[in-house]
Interface confidence: medium
């Protein structure tokens, strides 16, 4: 074992340490006699060598295949095969910032980071990503088009967890106050569907229309709604009597 | 191995400046090595002002500027960064960058500590 190598312990032999210390604190070295600075992902641990030292607390040192490419070692030409410190929890954390760390020992290191910088610590909410409340990534386009056409509509949210998409027809009566109509409703003409993606935490939903009446007309509105909030977007169906009454001016938003 | 400030010049209090130190020569792995930032003004001892691991993942900084620099580095570049904020009279000084092989996590603020030094790059600030 590497302890087979070690000597007597004489700490005034140890080198000195750097000035302002190590960023993930001290540890000894592999003879459990001089203090050395903890070792964080990716660096090498482990072994009898001088300064292979003992990886950070919340690491484990893993032997690794591959060399470790362009970083220290590489150029010394290091053994084929490298214990490096990995972090124990593979798994992504939640940070008190809201933002989602791979794991939580990068959610320590930007801890670190933000301190350095005079900034409040960051520290685990919880396992699992940061909960966040719907947004939409593409709203819906307006339409214009001639009865009997087949038209749709789609608007693609992302949220966590994972919204639910609904889709409103906006009505207003004559004294202008607005009601919502649920769809499908009894439509027959009208069909919703919704999929999961294209990334992960979005959900796509479209509105079919076909054959295109002139009730269908109107304000049609995509509505998210996760455990964190909720957010919607709406657009217009126009129906012309004529492919010409529909308006091609550029920059319009309107498509056919 | 070549270490080679650039970025600085004349600008006025409260303005910023981003300076760069990138480095050169064979068999140097810049990604094997911690990089720290100095300044030396006339008449005072060089002073250290921020430091940076090896990977990039930790940073330090020292009160003088602490809130108003970042040290950042782009290994596939071989170049470390100072951006400074808020500039004040006071930071009038010759900026070095150094480097010290490191194949650790560790922070690095005396003179003597660091191995490679740069030429410097002149920074002004006029009020």
């Known amino acids: 074992s590497s302890s087979d190598a070690c000597g007597p312990c004489v700490p005034a032999s140890c080198p000195a340490l750097p000035r302002l210390g190590c960023p993930l604190g001290e540890t000894r070295d592999a003879c459990g006699c001089c203090p050395v600075c903890a070792r964080g992902e990716g660096e090498p641990c482990g072994g009898g060598a001088a300064g292979r030292g003992h990886c950070a607390p919340g690491m484990e040192c893993v032997k690794s295949r591959k060399r470790r490419k362009g970083k220290a070692g590489a150029a010394a030409g290091g053994p084929a095969t490298l214990a490096v410190c990995v972090c124990k929890s593979r798994y992504p954390v939640c940070g008190s910032n809201g933002i989602t760390y791979p794991s939580g020992c990068q959610l320590r290191a930007a801890s670190l980071r933000a301190e350095s910088r005079g900034e409040k610590a960051i520290t685990q909410v919880s396992k699992g990503t940061c909960e966040q409340g719907p947004s939409i990534v593409t709203p819906p386009k307006d339409i214009w088009n001639v009865t009997g056409a087949k038209v749709f509509l789609s608007c693609e949210v992302i949220g966590i967890p994972t919204p639910v998409l609904i889709w409103n027809k906006v009505k207003r009566d004559h004294s202008g106050v607005q009601r919502t109509e649920l769809l499908p409703g009894d439509r027959e003409n009208l069909a919703i569907q919704t999929r999961g993606g294209p990334e992960k935490h979005e959900v796509t939903g479209w509105v079919l229309v076909s054959p295109l009446s002139k009730e269908d007309a109107g304000e049609y509105e995509c509505h998210a709604s996760n455990s964190q909030g909720q957010a919607s977007a709406a657009a217009k169906i126009t129906v012309v009597d004529a492919l010409h009454e529909i308006p091609l001016k550029k920059g319009e938003g309107a498509q056919l | 191995v070549q270490l080679q400030e650039s970025g600085g010049g004349l600008v006025q209090t409260g303005g910023s400046l981003r300076l760069s130190c990138a480095a050169s020569?064979?068999?140097?792995?810049?990604?094997?090595?911690?990089m720290g930032w100095f300044r030396h003004a006339p008449g005072k001892e060089r002073e250290f002002l921020t430091a940076?691991?090896?990977?990039?993942?930790?940073?330090y900084y020292t009160d003088s500027v602490k809130g108003r620099s970042t040290i950042s580095r782009d290994n596939a570049k071989n170049t470390v960064y100072l951006q400074l904020n808020n500039l004040k009279p006071e930071d009038t000084a010759v900026y070095y960058c150094a480097a010290k092989f490191s194949q650790v996590s560790a922070f690095f603020a005396t003179v003597s500590e660091y191995e490679y030094w740069g030429q410097g790059t002149q920074v002004t600030v006029s009020s």
């Open positions: 940076i691991t090896w990977s990039g993942d930790y940073t």
């Open positions: 020569g064979r068999s140097f792995t810049f990604s094997s090595y911690a």
